[in-house]
């Protein structure tokens, strides 16, 4: 998130010595918000670190881009930015680490420009279905965003709902198929355990993915087929344990793909040859040369690349007749 | 339904501090914010502090911003108001709301404790 430049000539403040000046008429159109920074030349509105509590109602018409970082909103409700005039050039919004733990339907209607939104570093315990496309209906109008980040918005454990927290996120983004032009989604640190299956499938202009940073123990259920456009996958500090082939076999069929692996807990036992030997002639995996294995005890920190089929092995299962007891 | 029982309330020198305490059961993060609000002798009552449950974002009233400090602990489902620099006409009936906007008006808020009497007199 960027934070205002105070000393930066083109920014001016809200001037309140105006305030008893100007109260009797309605507010100019180009003024700038209490508490907030703007530069018209730059078309730049930052509200940043100010303890607010709603998002200020007369902002300047010109606003192309909004920062209102390290606020206390708690709640953006349905129309949160619906000005009249609208606010028709606001294209980049960035609500990160403002306390929200709500976000309700339709909160970013009448916002026809908008196309990156960052909502990082609030704990979403209420992320409303329609938050994103802004009507129940089961194909709503295309949603401008082409950037959404959604890193760290897991509450913290004690202060979550009971009900799936990826499942909420997942239904955010596929209601109304509002988010078919999305190019950049960004999810990392939210301890997700699971990709539901159908997430991708209908976000195919995807060319950045970020799952970073959670706690994924497979992808066997996720299909990445439809991602042509995908340029890069990260899935960097999960619980991975192997990919399997056909897992494999769709990364290596998309044509622009560069995924990153590291530090998974990758476990090299007979399960795992196929993706040694994927990786050995692949170039889709950026610093593979990194990867290492975690279990069996014996295998840890041996390098992926440097394994032959003869390092995996699984120890047999015993039929139950000779097991002991 | 969420009951609220305040304690913490007396009589303190101006300049002094208190800690309010409201302790929520029932179904405590139903509401997802909590509020004091207060009322002075003949006066209305008027919306002091609010924390949200999740996030714990806060909003004060501009009469006790720097001096007053609202907080809650999940764990324990109580919620607190430390005043510190108090002056006279902090006195008042001190009373914790639950509801679910993130508001400051009355209406804000479906659940009331019964309040704990605060008096700053010298």
């Known amino acids: 998130s960027s934070s205002p430049t105070s000393s930066a000539s083109s920014f001016s403040s809200s001037a309140p010595f105006l305030a008893s000046a100007v109260s009797a008429q309605p507010p100019l159109p180009d003024q700038c918000p209490a508490l907030c920074e703007c530069s018209e030349a730059a078309r730049t509105v930052k509200c940043v670190n100010r303890n607010l509590t709603e998002v200020p109602t007369d902002l300047p018409a010109y606003v192309r881009n909004l920062f209102l970082t390290g606020n206390q909103l708690a709640v953006l409700p349905a129309g949160a930015f619906a000005r009249r005039p609208p606010l028709a050039e606001l294209a980049a919004l960035n609500l990160s680490g403002s306390r929200l733990d709500e976000v309700r339907a339709g909160a970013f209607e009448h916002l026809p420009s908008l196309r990156q939104l960052d909502l990082s570093h609030n704990p979403l315990a209420d992320l409303s279905p329609f938050a994103f496309s802004g009507s129940n209906a089961s194909v709503s109008a295309p949603s401008p965003l082409v950037e959404l980040i959604l890193n760290h918005i897991v509450p913290p454990e004690d202060e979550r709902q009971n009900r799936s927290f990826e499942g909420m996120v997942v239904a955010a983004l596929l209601a109304g198929r509002a988010l078919q032009g999305l190019r950049r989604l960004e999810l990392a640190s939210n301890h997700f355990l699971y990709l539901p299956r159908d997430v991708l499938a209908q976000l195919p202009s995807l060319r950045h993915l970020d799952l970073s940073n959670n706690s994924l123990v497979s992808l066997t259920y996720v299909s990445f087929r439809n991602l042509t456009h995908l340029e890069s996958l990260h899935l960097e500090d999960n619980a991975l344990k192997v990919l399997h082939n056909g897992t494999l076999a769709e990364l290596q069929g998309l044509p622009h793909i560069r995924v990153f692996l590291d530090n998974n807990p990758w476990v090299c036992d007979c399960h795992m040859a196929d993706m040694v030997t994927w990786l050995k002639e692949t170039e889709v995996v950026q610093g593979k040369d990194r990867l290492t294995c975690a279990y069996p005890e014996k295998m840890r920190n041996r390098v992926l690349l440097e394994l032959n089929s003869a390092d995996l092995d699984c120890d047999p299962i015993l039929p139950p007749s000779l097991q002991t007891s | 339904e969420v009951q609220l029982v305040e304690s913490g309330g007396g009589e303190v020198q101006p300049g002094g501090s208190l800690r309010l305490s409201c302790a929520a059961s029932?179904?405590?993060?139903?509401?997802?914010?909590m509020a004091w609000f207060r009322q002075a002798p003949g006066k209305e009552r008027e919306f002091v502090a609010a924390?949200?449950?999740?996030?714990?974002?806060?909003r004060y009233t501009e009469s006790v911003k720097g001096r007053f400090t609202i907080s809650r602990d999940n764990a324990k489902n109580t919620v607190y108001l430390q005043m510190s620099s108090l002056r006279a006409e902090d006195t008042a009936v001190y009373y914790c709301?639950?509801?679910?906007?993130?508001?400051?008006?009355?209406?804000?808020?479906?659940?009331w404790g019964q309040g704990t009497l605060v008096t700053v007199k010298p």
């Open positions: 709301a639950a509801g679910q906007a993130w508001g400051t008006k009355f209406t804000d808020y479906s659940d």
């Open positions: 029932g179904r405590p993060f139903s509401s997802k914010t």
């Open positions: 924390v949200r449950w999740i996030g714990g974002a806060t």
